[in-house]
């Protein structure tokens, strides 16, 4: 599912509509409609491959399918980074690559994909059902992570197909702010269109004074409140033993399965930073208990046995630490 936020040139409205609503009133609905229809959700894919030459040597490939610019990639094993996983490599597009054993060679393949070769020997070598996770921090989408592992009966030299299994690292601020504004906008748009349809249009005099609309501000929680904003995300059971289903419900909330769009406004750079944040391709949302928005009609992500839901112990803005991410 590669959907990029592309805002096409606005089509001129019908003459009757322009007369009815006026030029100013028209621009907002069209912009909102364009955003509602065209914007998409980024995704991370992970591919794990066992080398035929060295049976315990792995190649992990990860990519980011989104329109934002990547600011950092973290590859971990044994689970997501910061949630029991061990960091294997960190790749910064401008600062270079850092890696730790058993990682042997991490590299950028393209500007949005990376690969990592793991050593096959020693106490820290991976085993066949180890889970590898890739986390992409990007602007403006925020932080996205996906995990993958070899299927239990993989032949050497074969690879698991790329698994687009996005893991939630949602920034509540981004979700509530962006999704909320756009949801409101879509509802408002429908309201305007219905109103136009159901009543005659009075002639509007063009206003001489056009008061400036207040500029949208990107909302960010204070540091003190960040600790409480843990967003659950999913991963696949990791250790070298049979996987078991283990579901935790953060904050005692309900057990729920949904593909949740993550609209993290990552280091919003301007008052109108939300405008360029991707939104789901389908405009219908279903509200979930903790304030996240799940897309209606979308099946739960396909994950293997041992799906675990747990909060990020480092909080929703884990990738926005003071270091490394620029």
């Amino acid at each position: 599912m590669r959907t990029e936020a592309q805002v096409p040139a606005l089509q001129p409205p019908e003459p009757g509509l322009e007369g009815a609503m006026g030029h100013r009133t028209l621009v907002l609905p069209w912009v909102l409609l364009t955003l509602c229809v065209t914007a998409g959700t980024p995704e991370v894919w992970v591919q794990v491959r066992m080398e035929a030459t060295e049976l315990s040597s792995f190649t992990i490939r990860c990519g980011f399918l989104g329109s934002g610019s990547i600011s950092l990639v973290t590859v971990s094993w044994g689970g997501p980074n910061g949630a029991g996983g061990t960091t294997l490599a960190v790749l910064h597009p401008e600062r270079g690559i850092r890696q730790w054993a058993p990682a042997r060679q991490a590299r950028w393949e393209t500007q949005s994909s990376i690969s990592l070769i793991l050593e096959g020997s020693g106490a820290s070598s991976p085993c066949a059902n180890t889970t590898f996770c890739c986390k992409f921090a990007s602007f403006p989408e925020g932080s996205w992570e996906a995990c993958g592992s070899l299927p239990p009966s993989s032949d050497p030299g074969l690879s698991a197909p790329p698994t687009p299994a996005p893991i939630l690292r949602a920034d509540l601020a981004g979700i509530l702010g962006v999704s909320g504004v756009l949801l409101f906008g879509c509802v408002y748009l429908l309201h305007l269109l219905r109103r136009h349809k159901h009543r005659p249009a009075p002639r509007l005099q063009p206003s001489r004074t056009s008061p400036q609309a207040p500029r949208a501000r990107a909302w960010a929680p204070s540091q003190a409140s960040q600790a409480a904003l843990h967003v659950p995300y999913a991963t696949i059971n990791t250790s070298c033993r049979p996987a078991t289903l283990d579901t935790a419900h953060p904050h005692g909330g309900p057990s729920w399965w949904a593909s949740l769009p993550t609209h993290a406004a990552h280091r919003p750079q301007g008052p109108a930073a939300w405008a360029s944040t991707p939104i789901p391709a389908r405009g219908s949302f279903v509200s979930v208990e903790n304030g996240l928005y799940a897309q209606a009609g979308e099946r739960p992500p396909h994950t293997g046995p041992g799906l675990t839901l747990f909060p990020d112990p480092r909080g929703p803005r884990a990738m926005e630490g003071p270091l490394g991410v620029r």
Epitope: G82, T86, T87, L88, H92, P93, E94, R95, G96, I97, R98, W100, A101, P102, R107, W108, E109, T110, Q111, I114, S124, R314, A318, G321, P322, L323, G324
Partner: antibody, heavy 114, light 113 residues
Framework: QVQLQQPGAELVKPGTSVKLSCKAS?????SYWINWVKLRPGQGLEW???????????NYNEKFLNKATLTTDTASSTAYMQLNNLASEDSAVYYC???????WGQGTTLIVSA | DIVMTQSPSSLSVSAGEEVIMSCKSS????????????LAWYQQKPGQPPKLLIY???TRESGVPDRFTGSGSGTDFTLTINNVQAEDLAIYYC?????????FGGGTKLEIK
């Protein structure tokens, strides 16, 4: 704000060992790696190695493989570098720096003298 | 190991002048995937730890004045300081950010007349 605290100075005898510390604060210690850098007057900066807290496989500059041992204690958010079999050429200022050398400690001056 | 060579080893200029210092690497610092050159510059003032000035050859770290400009690619890089100020008195190091071990140049000492 981000801080890396290092002791100001250590005076040790040749042939002994010393364990230098670097206490991190102001960020999540397990989110970024710690580098160690040596500075000798007139000789410039030398990268000794780096360690990611929680990953027990540090990287070393080969030149320091038998000299330095890097460890971390996540409970106290502290990184350590042990230098063994000290000699006069080990006298230098040793810095710790986090991540991509974004933040640096003030450095520990190590004096190896009989 | 990648060897980083800086020149000149020291230079003395008057305030307001322009300074250009060079850094050469024994191997290319270009990353083929990102098409970025992984070279960083640091400033070390007397009695202080080094401070990151520029990374990725030309990207200024936040808070660094735009008087400091990095350029170059492959194996040849330069740091230019326009309108030198008294507070720029320091040793400037270039660093291979490309591959282990992360080697530094010998430094260029900038003195103000």
């Amino acid at each position: 704000q981000v801080q890396l605290q290092q002791p100001g100075a250590e005076l040790v005898k040749p042939g002994t060992s010393v364990k230098l510390s670097c206490k991190a604060s102001g960020y999540n210690f397990t989110s970024y790696w710690i580098n160690w850098v040596k500075l000798r007057p007139g000789q410039g900066l030398e990268w000794i190695g780096d360690i990611y807290p929680g990953n027990y496989s540090p990287n070393y500059n080969e030149k320091f493989l038998n000299k330095a041992t890097l460890t971390t204690d996540t409970a106290s958010s502290t990184a350590y570098m042990q230098l063994n079999n000290l000699a006069s050429e080990d006298s230098a200022v040793y810095y710790c720096a986090s991540g991509y050398f974004d933040y640096w400690g003030q450095g520990t001056t190590l004096i190896v003298s009989a | 190991d990648i060897v980083m060579t800086q020149s000149p080893s020291s230079l003395s200029v008057s305030a307001g002048e322009e300074v250009i210092m060079s850094c050469k690497s024994s191997q290319s610092l270009l990353n083929s995937g990102t098409q970025k050159n992984y070279l960083a510059w640091y400033q070390q003032k007397p009695g202080q730890p080094p401070k990151l000035l520029i990374y990725g050859t030309s990207t200024r770290e936040s808070g660094v004045p735009d008087r400091f400009t990095g350029s170059g690619s492959g194996t040849d890089f330069t740091l230019t300081i326009n309108n030198v100020q008294a507070e720029d008195l320091a040793i400037y190091y270039c660093q291979n950010d490309h591959s282990y071990p992360y080697t530094f140049g010998g430094g260029t000492k900038l003195e103000i007349k």
